[in-house]
C-alpha cells in the first residue's frame, strides 16, 4: 500500500476510533432522552426523568423559567436510578411511576450490543492488518464498522419510537421530551462509523486499472 493510502487509512481509522468511543459512551450512559410531566400545581417542581438503554433516572427539579413550564428542564442533583425491570427482574421500580415500552427497550439494547460487537471485531481485523501487513483485512474491518454504524442508527430509531410511544401513551404522565447528549453521541457515532467504514473500504481496495491494456493483475501487489 502506498504512503498516501496508508496515511488516508490511518486518518480514517482515527475517525472510526472516535466513533467507537462515542458509541461506547452512548450505550453505557443514561441521557438518551429527557422526559418531563405537567408542572405540579402545589409546588414548582418537575419530576423529570432521563433514561438510556438500560435504566431510568428521575429527579425533582425546581422550575425557574417565567412560563413555569416543565419543558427543557435538565434533571440534576439527587437522583433515583433503576434498571428497567426486564433487565433486572428482582428490582422494583415503582417509585419511577413509569411505563416502559419493554419490546422497544430490549430491541434497542440488543441492537446496540451488536453494534459494539461489530466495532470490536472490526478493530481486531484492523489491528491484525497493521501488525502483519495483511492489508486485505481492512476490507472486512471496514464492513464491520459500517455494519456497526447501521446497527447504531437502527438502535437510535427504535429509541425514538419508544420515546414517541411513551409520550403518546395515556398510561404515562410524561408530556414533554427532548433528546439529550447520549442520543447525540449515538448519532455522531453512526456518522463516523458508517462513513469511516465506507472510506476505509474505498482506501483498502486495490488500485483499479487506469489504462485499457492494464488488468487488475497489474495493480501494485499487496504485502
Amino acid at each position: 500500500m502506498s504512503q498516501t493510502k496508508t496515511a488516508k487509512v490511518r486518518v480514517t481509522l482515527f475517525f472510526i476510533l472516535v466513533g467507537g468511543v462515542l458509541a461506547m459512551v452512548a450505550v453505557v450512559t443514561d441521557h438518551w432522552a429527557v422526559l418531563s410531566p405537567h408542572l405540579e400545581h402545589h409546588n414548582e417542581t418537575c419530576e423529570a426523568a432521563h433514561f438510556g438503554l438500560w435504566r431510568i433516572c428521575t429527579a425533582r427539579v425546581a422550575v425557574h423559567n417565567k412560563d413555569k413550564s416543565c419543558e427543557h428542564v435538565t434533571p440534576s442533583g439527587e437522583k433515583n436510578c433503576s434498571y428497567f425491570r426486564h433487565f433486572n427482574p428482582g428490582e422494583s421500580s415503582e417509585i419511577f411511576e413509569f411505563t416502559t415500552q419493554k419490546e422497544y427497550s430490549i430491541s434497542a439494547a440488543a441492537i446496540a450490543i451488536f453494534s459494539l460487537g461489530f466495532i470490536i471485531v472490526g478493530s481486531i481485523c484492523a489491528f491484525l492488518s497493521f501488525g502483519n501487513k495483511r492489508d486485505y483485512l481492512l476490507r472486512p474491518a471496514s464492513m464491520f464498522y459500517a455494519f456497526a454504524g447501521l446497527c447504531l442508527i437502527v438502535s437510535v430509531e427504535v429509541m425514538r419510537q419508544s420515546v414517541k410511544r411513551m409520550i403518546d401513551s395515556e398510561d404515562t404522565v410524561w408530556i414533554e421530551h427532548y433528546y439529550s447528549w447520549s442520543f447525540a453521541c449515538a448519532c455522531a457515532a453512526f456518522i463516523l462509523l458508517f462513513l469511516g467504514g465506507l472510506f476505509l473500504l474505498l482506501f483498502s481496495l486495490p488500485r483499479m486499472p487506469q489504462n485499457p491494456w492494464e488488468s487488475c493483475m497489474d495493480a501494485e501487489p499487496e504485502h
Epitope: E170, D171, T172, V173, I175, E176
Partner: antibody, heavy 116, light 108 residues
Framework: QVQLQESGPGLVKPSETLSLTCTVS????????WTWLRQPPGKGLEWIGY???????NYNPSLKSRVTISVDTSKNQFSLKLNSVTAADTAVYYC??????????WGQGTLVTVSS | EIVLTQSPGTLSLSPGERATLSCRAS???????LAWYQQRPGQAPRLLIY???NRATAIPDRFSGSGSGTDFTLTISRLEPEDFEVYSC?????????FGGGTKVEIK
C-alpha cells in the same frame, strides 16, 4: 380487556363524606395510573385527580382541599373520598385508567346525589 | 386553567351529511394535546381522537380531528344513525385537565 366498575352510596347528605370505590378487572392495577372524573347533570366533565399504584396522587386544585384518592393493590381497587359535600357535588362519578392525558378505558359511572 | 368552549351547542343534521364541531381554547394548548369523546346517554365517554388528529383504536375513518393552537375541529364526514350523540373535547396540554361543555348532534 380492562373493565372498571364504580360502587358506593347513591345518596349522600350535605356536609358528609362521599366515598366511592372502583374495582378493576381484566388487568392488574399495578403499573398504571387511575383517575376519578365527574359530570354534573347537564354539564361537562370535570377531572378530580389521579393515583399511581404505588400511592402517589395528584388532584385538581379546585377540589384539592376536600379530596383523597387511595389505592388497594391487593383488592385491585382504588377509592375516592370527597369531604364536606354540597348539592354542587351531585354528579355522575366515573373512574378511568390514565392520569393526565386522555382516557380510553372508563367505568360505566355512578350517580351520586347530595341531598338531605 | 384552560377553558374550552364548544360550538354550536346543538347541531341539527340529517344522516349522510357532514358534521363540523368546533372547540376553542382560552389559551394555546401545548403540543396540540386535545382529545375528542363521544357520549351516549347513561354511558361513559368513548375516546375518538387524541393528539388533535390521531384516531383511537377501532374508531371509523369518518371521524377526523384537526386544528392547532386554540382552534380545533372534529369532522364526521358522513353521519350514520349511531353518530347522533353528544361530543366533548378535552385538553391535556396543562393541568388541570379540562373538558368542553359538549355539542349535541341531533337528527334534523
Amino acid at each position: 380487556q380492562v373493565q372498571l366498575q364504580e360502587s358506593g352510596p347513591g345518596l349522600v347528605k350535605p356536609s358528609e363524606t362521599l366515598s366511592l370505590t372502583c374495582t378493576v378487572s381484566g388487568d392488574s392495577i399495578n403499573n398504571y395510573y387511575w383517575t376519578w372524573l365527574r359530570q354534573p347533570p347537564g354539564k361537562g366533565l370535570e377531572w378530580i385527580g389521579y393515583i399511581y399504584y404505588s400511592g402517589s396522587a395528584n388532584y385538581n386544585p379546585s377540589l384539592k382541599s376536600r379530596v383523597t384518592i387511595s389505592v388497594d393493590t391487593s383488592k385491585n381497587q382504588f377509592s375516592l373520598k370527597l369531604n364536606s359535600v354540597t348539592a354542587a357535588d351531585t354528579a355522575v362519578y366515573y373512574c378511568a385508567r390514565g392520569a393526565v392525558k386522555y382516557f380510553r378505558h372508563w367505568g360505566q359511572g355512578t350517580l351520586v346525589t347530595v341531598s338531605s | 386553567e384552560i377553558v374550552l368552549t364548544q360550538s354550536p351547542g346543538t347541531l341539527s343534521l340529517s344522516p349522510g351529511e357532514r358534521a363540523t364541531l368546533s372547540c376553542r381554547a382560552s389559551q394555546t394548548i401545548n403540543h396540540n394535546n386535545l382529545a375528542w369523546y363521544q357520549q351516549r346517554p347513561g354511558q361513559a365517554p368513548r375516546l375518538l381522537i387524541y393528539g388533535a388528529s390521531n384516531r383511537a383504536t377501532a374508531i371509523p375513518d369518518r371521524f377526523s380531528g384537526s386544528g392547532s393552537g386554540t382552534d380545533f375541529t372534529l369532522t364526521i364526514s358522513r353521519l350514520e344513525p349511531e353518530d347522533f350523540e353528544v361530543y366533548s373535547c378535552q385538553q391535556y396540554g396543562s393541568l388541570p385537565l379540562t373538558f368542553g361543555g359538549g355539542t349535541k348532534v341531533e337528527i334534523k
